[in-house]
Interface confidence: low
Amino acid sequence: VPDKTVRWCAVSEHEATKCQSFRDHMKSVIPSDGPSVACVKKASYLDCIRAIAANEADAVTLDAGLVYDAYLAPNNLKPVVAEFYGSKEDPQTFYYAVAVVKKDSGFQMNQLRGKKSCHTGLGRSAGWNIPIGLLYCDLPEPRKPLEKAVANFFSGSCAPCADGTDFPQLCQLCPGCGCSTLNQYFGYSGAFKCLKDGAGDVAFVKHSTIFENLANKADRDQYELLCLDNTRKPVDEYKDCHLAQVPSHTVVARSMGGKEDLIWELLNQAQEHFGKDKSKEFQLFSSPHGKDLLFKDSAHGFLKVPPRMDAKMYLGYEYVTAIRNLREGTCPEAPTDECKPVKWCALSHHERLKCDEWSVNSVGKIECVSAETTEDCIAKIMNGEADAMSLDGGFVYIAGKCGLVPVLAENYNKSDNCEDTPEAGYFAIAVVKKSASDLTWDNLKGKKSCHTAVGRTAGWNIPMGLLYNKINHCRFDEFFSEGCAPGSKKDSSLCKLCMGSGLNLCEPNNKEGYYGYTGAFRCLVEKGDVAFVKHQTVPQNTGGKNPDPWAKNLNEKDYELLCLDGTRKPVEEYANCHLARAPNHAVVTRKDKEACVHKILRQQQHLFGSNVTDCSGNFCLFRSETKDLLFRDDTVCLAKLHDRNTYEKYLGEEYVKAVGNLRKCSTSSLLEACTFRRP
């Protein structure tokens, strides 16, 4: 019989008392075969973290800073359940740390040196740890003691709780640095008042502070937020302009064998029986013998943290960077304006080989990082292990939801001004064999389908979005008799046609022979009835253009397109017979890397782009024998985006809406994790 006990870790007598009460009350409402609570008392949160890692306890609730400690080796814990605040309809599990300034003050994030700063309090997250952590490498040396370095960076500060004797500059704006609301500039509202009164130039607070202190929009409009990319935004755009996004209070467990499903089952039942306004005799979110015992008193309930989310992703790149800077105190030798090498994310073996060749040719400008799936690459870019990659529009959508930004677009048409004119996009088409003359868009049910990969634009999002509107359910594996859609569950009928061997079967990378545009077309040639690809796929792989044995004798005339009106047309008539226009593939990166990725890639394409005539003896960035490695092989150049520099603007309203509708059918664990951070 599996052990269904969750050993909760308590850090004080009062917590242990509440834990025992929790245990006893859960026993009274949960059947004997359901989850139960046992209580383990430790002296501190760090002791609890160690106990969970050592399998002496299973769960504890932690603030963000401790979630970071819990994640570090050798603890390796992960977030499993988040407390939420606000309403069930609009649950808040995170807050945003922001830098607020007056509208007319005219400086940016990289010009804070010599300004006057207002902090909520020394050592507090939004008011100190995050801004100072992010500014750490700009502080004057020596950076220890930290308070001295901060005092020398700003021209005056109010940092409540600082030692006014040793660091008088930190108390210049609030003599004494009082550590309670008796200091008028203490806490969130105090730090904002410090800015409002004109004592300081910038206030480090959380996003809600300005709304709580200024009910009037006209008053709020006198303030702006400083963004990390050295721009400013209105205060209500905090989701796109913040220093870090911070989880409020989180239950952690072991990464392996951590009972995360059991913990969720327990807490979900607990909130049903003893959550807000549920029970008089025991309340989960109330602490009669103290404050915030086991859980925050202000919490309204729990949400399950998506399983794909590790602590790094949960805490977010900015927060982890800030805390790591503060803890480790390491900075590059001398900060220069030079861009560091761009770490390109390569998918599996074939892309890595091409990337390594690029790296050698780039003389240190490009480095390579490997991952097995596109989603793993996106996650690596998010957490700073990698910097950039080129993505199909469907993954640009996921990357955008995960906070990444498009920086350059692949262009596929030769033009005089290629780099300055991003194209409107390519066409997503449905290709069939001319010989299957009875097949139309309206009678695809029960046929064999070939897809580039799950989540990709032409191969999945567009055709499945259209199909979803028709069938109103997500059981595409029932609609088609079988198929190959790399990235599907291995036991799905949509993996049955795939050709990869062993563990590589149906994998969304080049180890699966039917992956990507060329792979999906090959699937049609060899096994399928319909392939969902781009308009250039058929001509690129017929007429001897693809020398591979399966393709070298193919003829474009043997294939036709399915039109949405139920008719069919020759392949060259794609402009009048397509499923939708798809946005071109685009390079994505983190916001903080945008400028450097842009600069280095433009240099790289001038050296290795389509102006290189002989790819047999030279490295060509946009060539890989029709395998679309790193970039699509038909890329002519990487083009500037101009003002289409967010994923919504880049993909366009129509496509974002189409993918949004398909979200109901999404099997993307990464998308689930990222929409948890930003619904």
């Epitope: 550590c179 309670s180 609301t181 008796l182 008028q184 509202s189 404050k291």
Partner: antibody, heavy 120, light 112 residues
Framework: EVQLQESGPDLVKPSQSLSLTCTVT?????????WHWIRQFPENKLEWLGY???????NYSPSLKSRFSITRDTSKNQFFLQLNSVTTEDTATYYC?????????????WGQGTTVTVSS | IELTQSPSSLAVSVGEKVTMTCKSS????????????LAWYQQKPGQSPKLLIY???TRESGVPDRFTGSGSGTDFTLTISSVKAEDLSVYYC?????????FGSGTKLEIK
Amino acid sequence: EVQLQESGPDLVKPSQSLSLTCTVTGYSITSGYSWHWIRQFPENKLEWLGYIHSSGATNYSPSLKSRFSITRDTSKNQFFLQLNSVTTEDTATYYCARDGYSPPYAMDYWGQGTTVTVSS
Amino acid sequence: IELTQSPSSLAVSVGEKVTMTCKSSQSLLYSTNQKNYLAWYQQKPGQSPKLLIYWASTRESGVPDRFTGSGSGTDFTLTISSVKAEDLSVYYCQQYYSYPPTFGSGTKLEIK
């Protein structure tokens, strides 16, 4: 149990400085909380003067800032009030108190008070 | 912030209910935590003030439940449900919302 006890002169001449001591027992003043001085005038009006936090940070009433300071001697677990250039207006009973944090920022422990008369 | 207490004094018999008010010149409700930053103290003759109520309505431990604090924003009330002889005191309200903290002028409770 936490106890606070004020001590100092009963009588001070105008223009002189007033120094008072608060001795705390049952709790270390460096372990936490803020430690305050409050005074009560003969007509019973209460006035907050300032505090010293366990970290050593101080905060004073704006009306007295220029002639008022609070210091401490951690080895003796004492904190001190110094009021310069006193006038007859400073005649009052002076209390030291602790601000509780729980309950936050309200004074949960007070000394018995020491009465100071400013007169020539 | 100015706190105005009324009445300045009142005389009641043992067992009676007493209500006294404290009016603030600005709101003491902090929207972040929905708490009112107001405390009530009792000062018996010849003694130092004693904390009765904080957060406008939370009784300090050991304070009899006949003492109740209520109100929000700018208007606050201290109620003694059934006065006892030992309740003879001056009662002060104090705000700790804004720097510097300030006290009301007090309400003197006398026993008839």
